[in-house]
């Protein structure tokens, strides 16, 4: 009988092993080893045994010891098991962004490694084991599906192999893939809320606010705001899981008409959009026209208000009849009309919304000069030594200058308090003069002497 020692060997790939072959008889006719592996006999051997060194063992092998004794021929095999750790342990790339609530499939590929029976593949989240499977096939592919939550954002996933040769080799060989970091996101199914003016006047500033709740991670969200072809530049405010983008918008006459306001919130590989129609309009203040802004009294004046062709106007409390963009009326200018305001209000309906404008013009009426009995009495009788204030008011536009003189030299102190003396008595010629001409009026002052009895 032939014996081999050791009967089983686990050795690293490319390693060497010494194997002893022995025969049961003292003087075997022949004793040897059959193997394809490079072998070297270690001398000196014994009468009934030989030691061989097998080197560069690359794969599992079963070298055979044989002996030929008088009682017959026999053989025995030693089992060489080669171990080696995998050459490649790789976790398939994760999606750039993974939606929260959607299952993620982790896939690991393992190339090489032996013995496969002792090779286990694990999928890990950080150091937490998600799945443990045997390595099957070449390359071995292991997959597992895991639900994804917000707390998985930034988590590292990896794949690890374990070559467990215990108790033969007091060692556990581990190979770990490069970790992959998961980026998760949560974009709600609801579109962003867009608050903006429904109508916007040319050359005025409007404010647009776009907001969305339930975003994760909110810091990674991007907002795009545009009105027609005009990209807006919003200021973004972030909340816990919300954002609000606020932008000012100014529109020009070229953009007049209906424009689409678009707000898009992008997160991960998804976008939520809201569109709203904004009507851009031009609405100059109505024109108030007077045939002449300055006229002489008695002149006929046409006051006209004209507004946007689709507007409806009201001129000095009188609506256009029928309601429309033009209203006018005729008046004969009187002194009372001087400084009179003519106000025109216009209403324009833009996409169902009402916008209002107004304009005011003043009329100047030239009249006078005038000296009336009411404002400049022709006769005064005052007691001597009394305190009196001579009054004479000239009217006109432009305001006339007034002089009252006695004998062309002695002035009557108009509007001043005076002590009445004999000198004050007499007839004064009051003259009111403006660029429009002059009028005169005689004013007589009588002084009553006190009676002494």
């Amino acid at each position: 009988q032939t014996s081999v020692f050791p009967p089983e060997v686990i050795l690293p790939r490319g390693g060497s092993v010494k194997v002893n072959c022995s025969a049961s008889c003292d003087q075997p006719i022949s004793l040897g080893m059959e193997t394809p592996l490079p072998k070297k006999e270690i001398l000196p051997g014994g009468n009934n045994w030989k030691m061989y060194e097998l080197s560069n063992v690359q794969e599992d092998s079963q070298p055979m010891c044989y002996s030929n004794c008088p009682d017959g021929q026999s053989s025995a095999k030693t089992l060489l098991t080669v171990y080696w750790t995998p050459e490649r342990v790789e976790l398939a790339p994760l999606p750039p962004w993974q939606p929260v609530g959607k299952n993620l499939t982790l896939r690991c590929q393992v190339e090489g490694g032996a013995p496969r029976a002792n090779l286990t593949v694990m999928l890990l989240r950080g150091e937490k084991e998600l799945s443990r499977q045997s390595a099957v096939g070449e390359p071995a592919e292991v997959t597992t599906t895991v639900p994804v939550g917000r707390d998985d954002h930034g988590a590292n996933f990896s794949c690890r192999t374990e070559l467990d040769l215990r108790p033969y080799v007091l060692k556990l060989f581990e190979n770990t893939s490069a970790p992959h970091q998961l980026q998760t996101f949560d974009l709600p199914a609801t579109p962003p809320q867009l608050v903006s003016p429904q109508v916007l006047e040319v050359d005025t500033q409007g404010t647009v606010v776009c907001s969305l709740d339930g975003l994760f991670p909110v810091s990674e969200a991007q907002v795009s705001l545009a009105l027609g072809d005009q990209k807006l530049n919003p200021t973004i405010t972030y909340g816990n899981n919300s954002l609000s983008a606020k932008a000012s918008v100014k529109v020009t006459a070229e953009e007049e008409g209906t424009q689409q306001l678009l707000c898009g919130v992008m997160l991960g590989n998804q976008t939520q959009e809201t569109r709203q129609t904004v009507t851009i309009y031009s609405f100059p203040a109505p024109n108030v026209n007077l045939t002449k802004p300055e006229v002489s009294e008695g002149t006929e004046v046409i006051v006209e208000c004209e507004a946007h062709p689709r507007a409806k106007v009201m001129l000095n409390g009188v609506p256009a009849q029928p309601p429309g963009p033009r209203a006018q009326f005729l008046l004969k200018a009187t002194p009372e009309d001087n400084g009179r305001s003519f106000s025109c209000s216009a209403t324009l309906e833009v996409a169902g919304q009402l916008v209002h404008k107004n304009q005011t013009r003043e009329l100047r009426v030239l009249y006078g000069p005038r000296l009336d009995e009411k404002d400049c009495p022709g006769n005064w009788t005052w007691p001597e030594n009394s305190q009196q204030t001579p009054m004479c008011q000239a009217w006109g536009n432009p305001l006339p200058q007034l002089k009252c003189l006695k004998d062309g030299t002695f002035p009557l102190p108009i509007g001043q308090s005076v002590t009445v003396t004999r000198d004050l008595e007499g007839t004064y010629l009051c003259q009111a003069r403006s660029t429009r001409g002059e009028v005169t009026r005689e004013v007589t002052v009588n002084v009553l002497s006190p009676r002494y009895e």
């Epitope: 429904q198 109508v199 129609t277 689709r310 409806k312 106007v313 009201m314 409390g317 609506p319 029928p322 309601p323 106000s343 025109c344 209000s345 209403t347 309906e349 996409a351 169902g352 919304q353 009402l354 209002h356 107004n358």
Partner: antibody, heavy 122, light 110 residues
């Protein structure tokens, strides 16, 4: 000045129905007219408006379900494909006023009809 | 859209008491607000226009106030005839997709 609705009746779902509002004492050429409805036990719901120049605007829920048009004396509301949810009293209202102090026009339902009942039932 | 939020949805008041109904607009509607009273089987009746102007024939116990976004209807010295549903209505916009009326306030007089 008055408005009066007519045309309300019992219809089966999907059968188009046209309601008419007749104006008296004022010209529709100078006013905006609104349609408003009220389901049994519910609040007032604005449907839409037609302007003096025939522009129409609708509540978001009413778009595509209703069409407003007018002649010189009447305003029509067509319910294109009635459903049981359209069972309601339908009112027509003059919806345009002039504020004499500011000179501005504004929307103001100052004149209402008595309403006409539409029942949609299979 | 100019959303109109009316509070409360319903309320009870004793004869002689005071009713206060609030109406809030989601955006500035200046003073373009009207209040309506509606009784069962009748069309709405306009009580107040331009936020505070009393419509002709409306008793002076009805008072409207406010501007911008906050408006109030006050009924002082409530009478049994005031039992009705009250609605606010904005007069600023009739754009597509617009909201015109508040949800209504039912007033029950005890």
């Amino acid at each position: 000045q008055s408005v009066e609705e007519s045309g309300g009746r019992l219809v089966t779902p999907g059968t188009p129905l046209t309601l008419t509002c007749t104006a008296s004492g004022f010209s529709l050429n100078n006013y905006y007219m609104s349609w408003v409805r009220q389901a049994p036990g519910k609040g007032l719901e604005w449907i839409g408006i037609i302007s003096d120049s025939d522009n129409t605007y609708y509540a978001s829920w009413a778009k595509g379900r209703f069409t407003i048009s007018k002649t010189s004396t009447t305003v029509d509301l067509k319910i294109t494909s009635p459903t049981t949810e359209d069972t309601a009293t339908y009112f027509c209202a003059r919806d345009w006023s002039l504020d004499s102090s500011s000179g501005y026009y504004y929307y103001d339902m100052d004149l209402w009809g008595p309403g006409t009942l539409v029942t949609v039932s299979a | 859209a100019y959303d109109m939020t009316q509070t409360p949805a319903s309320m009870e008041v004793a004869v002689g008491g005071t009713v206060t109904i609030k109406c809030q607009a989601s955006q500035n509607i200046h003073s373009w607000l009207a209040w309506f009273q509606q009784k069962p089987g009748q069309p709405p009746k306009r009580l107040i226009y331009k936020a505070s102007t009393l419509a002709s024939g409306v008793p002076s116990r009805f008072k409207g106030s406010g501007s911008g976004t906050q408006f109030t209807l006050t009924i002082s010295g409530v009478q049994s005839d005031d039992a009705a549903t009250y609605y606010c209505q904005q007069g600023y916009s009739r754009s597509d997709g617009e909201h015109v009326f508040g949800g209504g306030t039912e007033v029950v007089v005890k």
